[in-house]
Amino acid sequence: QAGPLPKPTLWAEPGSVISWGNSVTIWCQGTLEAREYRLDKEESPAPWDRQNPLEPKNKARFSIPSMTEDYAGRYRCYYRSPVGWSQPSDPLELVMTGAYSKPTLSALPSPLVTSGKSVTLLCQSRSPMDTFLLIKERAAHPLLHLRSEHGAQQHQAEFPMSPVTSVHGGTYRCFSSHGFSHYLLSHPSDPLELIVSGSLEDPRPSPTRSVSTAAGPEDQPLMPTGSVPHSGLRRHWE
């Protein structure tokens, strides 16, 4: 008896991180024997959508003409052949940016830093959030994020880097997000250029501890009341 049908491949074009209002196409590729393709979205009634295969029957297209909050989430696809349904594909996480206003990203004490010294990148959001993501352009592992362990919402998160080396130099942006859906991100912050001077080299730089700060009282939009180390935010490299 033949083993289970091989799982299909699931991907999104132009990518899996889509700005609000932009179009995205989800592709599911199975085998030439496929008769039907099904796309399931986590926490949605299954199936989320069904499509007939496109010739030569080894893939199907699921179109999202205008990205909104409702489409953000985790997807899997299956195909049906004469012998039954396939295994599920690996999940595709479709993320929407533009769900909230852009945070602001600062470098303290300055974006000009000497190799071997310390710098902290500070990401601040307009409304309280529980996840902050730091992105470095053209990095092999660009995503670093701080997430509140207790659902405590913060207006800002700090990403300290020490000691700084030339590898830390580059262009950074940050995003913020709410715990109720990590598939919904803010607009990206304006870019911040971190310039490292000096010649100390360290091939494996890593940020140190994280710090989050609650916002001040209502009449002071972003004058924090004080820094609390860690404060419920947990660091993840992704």
């Epitope: 609000w20 909104t68 909230y100 206003s101 600062s106 500070l122 307009r126 409304s127 939009p221 972003l222």
Partner: antibody, heavy 117, light 113 residues
Framework: EVQLVQSGAEVKKPGASVKVSCKAS????????IDWVKQPPGKGLEWIGY????????SYNQKFKGRATMTVDKSTSTVYMELSSLRSEDTAVYYC??????????WGQGTTVTVSS | DIVMTQSPDSLAVSLGERATINCKSS????????????LAWYQQKPGQAPRLLIY???TRESGVPDRFAGSGSGTDFTLTISSLQAEDVAVYYC?????????FGQGTKLEIK
């Protein structure tokens, strides 16, 4: 394209109330604060308050507290501001504006409210 | 409340010349948390809504011509138009967003000489 489209001009008598609407489109409505700003004829800009559509949270300038009420209808992506106990000095253009980070990156076209007996 | 005071109230500048508008706040707008100044500049043409030009005192909004520049820190800020164009005739406002209530300057009317 982000757009904030406001309701038309209103003429009201002193003591009456007026309700101005601001319909948002072209962005994720729930995640952005909407503020209201007053501009009397030939004068400057005065901040009235904000509403956060996601939660309905509001905050008002003390000067307008008790007379201004902001509400939201998420099903139509519309924010409303009601101003009660109108007096002649409430004659102004009222703008809704989308907050970026406490500053305003998009504005409605304005609604003229005239208070006259 | 933070009081924002602009000077001059009105200004007439020849086409192609530099226009300078000043804005003074009654307390510092420089945040110790991020070393940013919580100040924005807007342009309002007759019969139109205001338009954001500058935020964080010196960051130009997308689509704003580079002849507009913001500078200053603490309590003293400047909006400079390096080479005045006919379409720059408008009233210009500064706004502080350091603390509530948000407040604006009284406006500076810019005209062609």
């Amino acid at each position: 394209e982000v757009q904030l489209v406001q309701s038309g001009a209103e003429v009201k008598k002193p003591g009456a109330s007026v309700k101005v609407s601001c319909k948002a489109s072209g962005y994720s409505f729930s995640g952005f604060y909407i503020d209201w700003v007053k501009q009397p004829p030939g004068k400057g800009l005065e901040w009235i308050g904000y509403i956060f559509p996601s939660s309905g949270e509001t905050s008002y300038n003390q000067k307008f507290k008790g007379r201004a009420t902001m509400t939201v209808d998420k099903s139509t992506s519309t924010v409303y501001m009601e101003l009660s106990s109108l007096r002649s000095e409430d004659t102004a253009v009222y703008y809704c504006a989308r907050q970026a980070f406490y500053y305003f990156d998009y504005w409605g076209q304005g609604t003229t409210v005239t208070v006259s007996s | 409340d933070i009081v924002m005071t602009q000077s001059p109230d009105s200004l007439a500048v020849s086409l192609g010349e530099r226009a300078t508008i000043n804005c003074k706040s009654s307390q510092s707008l420089l945040s110790s948390s991020n070393q940013k100044n919580y100040l924005a500049w807007y342009q309002q043409k007759p019969g139109q809504a205001p338009r954001l030009l500058i935020y964080w005192a010196s960051t130009r909004e997308s689509g704003v011509p580079d002849r507009f520049a913001g500078s200053g820190s603490g309590t003293d800020f400047t909006l400079t138009i390096s080479s005045l164009q006919a379409e720059d005739v408008a009233v210009y406002y500064c706004q502080q967003y350091y603390s509530y209530p948000l407040t604006f300057g009284q406006g500076t009317k810019l005209e062609i000489k």
